[in-house]
Structures are given as structure tokens and as C-alpha cells.
């Protein structure tokens, strides 16, 4: 398990509506408490189930939200982000950024909808078993001769 | 821990009026929502009335009869239930949800009757008309 470790990185705007959970997920990060190292910006936390994010399915925990409403997350402040989301109003359209895992290691998350989310052994085990199934059958054909 | 108290139900007459109360304790948020629901015998439990700091909303069974209200200096939800029928009779419940949000904002919103949203209830109120 000690090869390289590739990720697929995709981004997706979901639209989510507030309910009487909220928009059912909190975050961390800003440039006072990095979550990431090197990485200020503001990540999903944890979602909750049966709210508004659950809910809408697109949206994971590790899940980095670029922008809020058009408005950009970068360099901020968390209680500055806090505000963004406050003043985002009943409706709120989020960029965020999926990160997969395709190698080496647990599978990461990935976005519902996003095709080329397919960690590579999930490829890799239908063709090795149809590989061996067709030998055997080769072999058998070629015994009956 | 959170905590919601229902009182005020009773048996009344068709036409009739009664006030029930939902005293709320354990929120660290402001913004809590706190709905009403009710459940007649044999009967799924039904969404009757929600209110937040920014929207109300009610089934259209009781609109224009039920008006509901929140003093949050007392952390307590009313429910103002007018022109009492006898479909009205069941045990009504008081809920409110977790907040998960960025901001600690939560509304109703337009799916509020859905019984998945709500974290907490009460143990119910029983109202009688009759």
C-alpha cells in the first residue's frame, strides 16, 4: 500500500434550500483554523441525516466549498464564511469541490452523477474474471477436440 | 438535553376554542423552529403548523382557524386553535430539529410537514371536540 496515491478532483454547483435544520451540514476551516495543512479554505465538516444536504445526496463530509452565492471562500476569516452563509438566504447555491481517492487505499467520496468518479479496481476485477472465465472455457473446447 | 412540554389540550365543543403551549428548554440557537403536529387514532401523524424567526406555515385544513405564535422570552410556541371541528380531535405533538447549518440559520420551509425533519418531540397534548 505504499505506491502513489491519485485523486480525482471535480467540482459541482449544488443548490440547496434551508429547513427547519438548517442547510443540514456545518464546516470548518478559514484562515484562522486550518483544517487542511497549507489550505485555508472552508471545508464540510459533518452533514447530518435527514437534513436539507443529506437530503439533496450530492454533498460529503471532506467536501471544500469554494464559493457561496457566487461569493468566493477563498482567504476568509471563519467567522467571516459564517457570515457569507448567513446572508445567503433561504436559498443557497454552493461550488464545491469533490476529491477522490482512486488508488491505493479506502475509496474516497465522490459526487452523485459524476461518471468518471470509478475507482480503477472497480474496472479492473469484472475483466479478470471474465479473462479467466473465457480460459477455462477455451481450455475446456480445446479438451473435447 | 432538549426538552419540549405540550399543555392546553381538553375536551370542547364544535365551534369551540382552545390555546396549546410548547415550552422549549436545552437550545443553544436563536433560530430554533418548532412545529405542530397531530396523530388521530388509527391516523398517520400529520403536519398541522410551523413557525421560525422568518416564515409560519400552516396545512390547509386549519388555515384561517389555527394561528401559531412563539414568545421567545418564555422559549414558548402557542398554538391558537378557533372554530374547533371534530376532524380536530387527536393528540397534538410539538417538534423541533437540530440545527446543522453554517450559520445556525434553520426556517420552516416549504417541506416542513415532513416528520423526518424533526429531531424532538414532545410526549402530546390530547384535544377532544365533541
Known amino acids: 500500500m505504499n505506491g502513489r496515491v491519485d485523486y480525482l478532483v471535480t467540482e459541482e454547483e449544488i443548490n440547496l434550500t434551508r429547513g427547519p435544520s438548517g442547510l443540514g451540514f456545518n464546516i470548518v476551516g478559514g484562515t484562522d483554523q486550518q483544517y487542511v495543512s497549507n489550505d485555508s479554505g472552508i471545508y464540510v465538516s459533518r452533514i447530518k441525516e435527514n437534513g436539507a444536504a443529506a437530503l439533496d445526496g450530492r454533498l460529503q463530509e471532506g467536501d471544500k466549498i469554494l464559493s457561496v452565492n457566487g461569493q468566493d471562500l477563498k482567504n476568509l476569516l471563519h467567522q467571516d464564511a459564517v457570515d457569507l452563509f448567513r446572508n445567503a438566504g433561504y436559498a443557497v447555491s454552493l461550488r464545491v469541490q469533490h476529491r477522490l481517492q482512486v488508488q491505493n487505499g479506502p475509496i474516497g467520496h465522490r459526487g452523485e452523477g459524476d461518471p468518471s468518479g470509478i475507482p480503477i479496481f472497480m474496472v479492473l476485477v469484472p475483466v479478470f474474471a471474465l479473462t479467466m472465465v473465457a480460459a477455462w472455457a477455451f481450455m475446456r473446447y480445446r479438451q473435447q477436440l | 438535553d432538549v426538552q419540549l412540554v405540550e399543555s392546553g389540550g381538553g375536551l370542547v365543543q364544535p365551534g369551540g376554542s382552545l390555546r396549546l403551549s410548547c415550552a422549549a428548554s436545552?437550545?443553544?440557537?436563536?433560530?430554533?423552529?418548532i412545529s405542530w403536529f397531530r396523530q388521530a387514532p388509527g391516523k398517520e401523524r400529520e403536519g398541522v403548523s410551523c413557525?421560525?424567526?422568518?416564515?409560519?406555515y400552516y396545512a390547509d385544513s386549519v388555515k384561517g382557524r389555527f394561528t401559531i405564535s412563539r414568545d421567545n422570552a418564555k422559549n414558548t410556541v402557542y398554538l391558537q386553535m378557533n372554530s374547533l371541528k371534530p376532524e380536530d380531535t387527536a393528540v397534538y405533538y410539538c417538534?423541533?430539529?437540530?440545527?446543522?447549518?453554517?450559520?445556525?440559520?434553520?426556517?420552516?420551509?416549504?417541506?416542513?410537514?415532513?416528520?423526518?425533519?424533526?429531531?424532538?418531540w414532545g410526549q402530546g397534548t390530547q384535544v377532544t371536540v365533541s
Open positions: 417538534a423541533t430539529a437540530a440545527i446543522w447549518d453554517p450559520s445556525g440559520l434553520a426556517v420552516c420551509g416549504s417541506s416542513w410537514y415532513r416528520r423526518g425533519w424533526w429531531d424532538y
Open positions: 413557525i421560525s424567526s422568518s416564515d409560519t
Open positions: 436545552g437550545f443553544t440557537s436563536d433560530y430554533y423552529v
